[in-house]
Interface confidence: low
């Protein structure tokens, strides 16, 4: 029996309320509303959520009550369309309300903004936060859900419940500690960094489903789950892939109640069948629901079964290859991907998908040839360059990272990517290059066998950030091309880009390089971003500048900031020395 085959319910909203419980129901509705209406004030969302919750309770009491038979999209969409300021705040998004379901929901989805114009979240003093937490714990935690959801409109909702649980635990523990800050700040930093990573990973899953379709997502899932559960049978992996695809399709589609409910069912199924899935699940399956689901999603790869036979027998040497392929193409390719992935935890998922694509292309060509076997006999030889390309790239970049350290490695990537796609906005180039640069500290410490899955799959997540940000305001045909042609070849596509010779350098604007005393009070990270912003602008002005020229100017800039931050009259120093720096930089770069 499929995990998600349920009896029909008279009232979907009552069914989900009963399955999830009031607390999770309210939290998920709040996340859903905040992800759709990202500019609405917190209080407005809370009011809407309370109204939906009260309505759900009437349906629990009597499933035949008025409107209880309506779909969740209809109920939630009707509620969102009651917001008075919809047209003023969201402009054309208000036109969605004139549509019927399912078009209305699709319309809301299309208006989700990956880069909403919202103020940066500033962390208050620890004592202020602890007071707010103690004064009204429920509001404090709701505010957390709201602020994260509106800034990350594709955040994986059931996982956000897990983050909120950890957020609550951190405050519960640390607000009574002797040194509140020492206890709390590392935990909040960890939650922030993990949250950003989780959001970006989920954004790639949604992009995969929405831009490349269910087949692309399923292929990714087959490869990843086969690496993770190499002892599981192909049929078991296929079942998990089908169920996982349903969960992510729901969450990416805004069906958060169904998604959370189905994710819980999937975790239950995995734990009930762990003997036939993986030996690594025992600890996960002893945890409470939210922790359990998270733990399963992050579980380490199981050991590979001993003595797996050669792949060539079934996929190259067998006389039935074309017959098997013709009978059920996707099943046969799925089996190939499963068998290859379970043998190669040392490969990235995207590499495995490239190999599967090459195999598919070869069979398409060869199974129509006069001598199919002769034609595809050497197909595995075609894999060698595909495997070596990411291996060499990772080796070179890890060497560069070890030589430079994270900050300077990021700067090297900033220069590299600005020269490739100089039309992209400076904040996007800085954000993406900084994240690309983090691959060094994240992955280069790993042994060879773990480097590629760590690095290349992480780069896929970061490059997807570039793609979704660029899609909002497309400025570069090269970015559009790399982002849309092939999901699995995005990284090689960007790696292959050379300096854009068609780019007309930006006019020099002294204002871009004018700095003030406020830079002295910034945190280290913020100061790095300021310097990296200046670096991108320099490259946009002088794309042909050499590494040495750029280094000289950046060294002068660092010395200038240090000098003026030590000066008694900082503002005057920044004004006077800044003019000299601009003149010297122009001379050094021949501007």
């Amino acid at each position: 029996r499929g995990v998600f085959r349920r009896d029909a319910h008279k009232s979907e909203v009552a069914h989900r309320f009963k399955d999830l419980g009031e607390e999770n129901f309210k939290a998920l509705v709040l996340i859903a509303f905040a992800q759709y209406l990202q500019q609405c004030p917190f209080e407005d969302h809370v009011k809407l959520v309370n109204e939906v919750t009260e309505f759900a309770k009437t349906c629990v009491a009597d499933e035949s009550a008025e409107n209880c038979d309506k779909s969740l999209h209809t109920l939630f969409g009707d509620k969102l369309c009651t917001v008075a300021t919809l047209r003023e705040t969201y402009g054309e998004m208000a036109d969605c309300c004139a549509k019927q379901e399912p078009e209305r929901n699709e319309c809301f989805l299309q208006h989700k903004d990956d880069n909403p114009n919202l103020p940066r979240l500033v962390r208050p003093e620890v004592d202020v936060m602890c007071t707010a937490f103690h004064d009204n714990e429920e509001t404090f935690l709701k505010k957390y859900l709201y602020e994260i959801a509106r800034r990350h409109p594709y955040f994986y909702a059931p996982e956000l419940l897990f983050f909120a649980k950890r957020y609550k635990a951190a405050f519960t523990e640390c607000c009574q500690a002797a040194d509140k800050a020492a206890c709390l700040l590392p935990k909040l930093d960890e939650l922030r960094d993990e949250g950003k990573a989780s959001s970006a990973k989920q954004r790639l899953k949604c992009a995969s489903l929405q831009k490349f379709g269910e087949r692309a997502f399923k292929a990714w899932a087959v490869a990843r789950l086969s690496q993770r559960f190499p002892k599981a049978e192909f049929a078991e992996v296929s079942k998990l892939v089908t169920d996982l695809t349903k969960v992510h399709t729901e969450c990416c589609h805004g069906d958060l109640l169904e998604c959370a409910d189905d994710r819980a069912d999937l975790a239950k199924y995995i734990c009930e069948n762990q003997d036939s899935i993986s030996s690594k699940l025992k600890e996960c399956c002893e945890k409470p629901l939210l922790e359990k689901s998270h733990c399963i999603a992050e579980v380490e790869n199981d050991e590979m079964p001993a003595d797996l036979p050669s792949l060539a027998a079934d996929f190259v040497e067998s006389k039935d290859v074309c017959k098997n392929y013709a009978e059920a193409k996707d099943v046969f390719l799925g089996m190939f991907l499963y068998e290859y992935a379970r043998r190669h935890p040392d490969y990235s998922v995207v590499l495995l998908l490239r190999l599967a694509k090459t195999y598919e292309t070869t069979l398409e060509k060869c199974c129509a040839a006069a001598d199919p076997h002769e034609c595809y006999a050497k197909v595995f030889d075609e894999f060698k360059p595909l495997v070596e390309e990411p291996q060499n790239l990772i080796k070179q970049n890890c060497e560069l990272f070890e030589q430079l350290g994270e900050y300077k490695f990021q700067n090297a990537l900033l220069v590299r990517y600005t020269k490739k796609v100089p039309q992209v906005s400076t904040p996007t180039l800085v954000e993406v290059s900084r994240n690309l640069g983090k691959v060094g500290s994240k992955c280069c410490k790993h042994p060879e066998a773990k480097r590629m899955p760590c690095a290349e799959d992480y780069l896929s997540v970061v490059l997807n950030q570039l793609c979704v940000l660029h899609e909002k305001t497309p400025v570069s045909d090269r970015v559009t091309k790399c982002c849309t042609e092939s999901l699995v070849n995005r990284r090689p596509c960007f790696s292959a880009l050379e300096v854009d010779e068609t780019y007309v350098p930006k006019e020099f604007n002294a204002e871009t390089f004018t700095f003030h005393a406020d830079i002295c009070t910034l945190s280290e990270k913020e100061r790095q971003i300021k310097k990296q912003t200046a670096l991108v602008e320099l490259v946009k002005h002088k794309p042909k500048a050499t590494k040495e020229q750029l280094k000289a100017v950046m060294d002068d800039f660092a010395a200038f900031v240090e000098k003026c931050c030590k000066a008694d009259d900082k503002e005057t120093c920044f004004a006077e020395e800044g003019k000299k720096l601009v003149a010297a930089s122009q001379a050094a770069l021949g501007l």
């Epitope: 003093e125 040194d179 900050y407």
Partner: nanobody, 115 residues
Framework: QVQLVESGGGLVQAGGSLRLSCAAS????????MSWVRQAPGKGPEWVSA????????RYAESVKGRFTISRDNAKKTLYLQMNSLKPEDTAVYYC????????GSQGTQVTVSS
């Protein structure tokens, strides 16, 4: 359990030097920026100096610039504050914090500068 233990304080003549240490445990020391904060008798906490996670960038309050040097040894999970040309107004309890908080929690180490 996060723990920060300061040491190295003491009584010193004006113009003298001290080196404070802060031993950290219970968290990934190398992943966090650190600060030194001080609290003089009857006054609120005052931020003194900060250093980034890699030990590359450092910052100082105006009152100690040129006299104090912050450093760290990530392998030893230890933060340092070298204090030279000490003045009577540097008398305070010094304690280290994670990030740039001025919330006092650890015991701190007493520095007394006599004239």
């Amino acid at each position: 359990q996060v723990q920060l233990v300061e040491s190295g304080g003491g009584l010193v003549q004006a113009g003298g030097s001290l080196r404070l240490s802060c031993a950290a445990s219970g968290f990934t020391f190398g992943s966090f920026g650190m600060s030194w904060v001080r609290q003089a008798p009857g006054k609120g906490p005052e931020w003194v100096s900060a250093i980034d996670s890699g030990g590359v960038d450092t910052r100082y309050a105006e009152s100690v610039k040129g006299r104090f040097t912050i450093s760290r040894d990530n392998a030893k999970k230890t933060l340092y504050l070298q204090m030279n040309s000490l003045k009577p107004e540097d008398t305070a309890v010094y304690y280290c914090t994670i990030g740039q908080s001025t919330s006092r929690g650890s015991q701190g180490t007493q520095v007394t500068v006599s004239s």
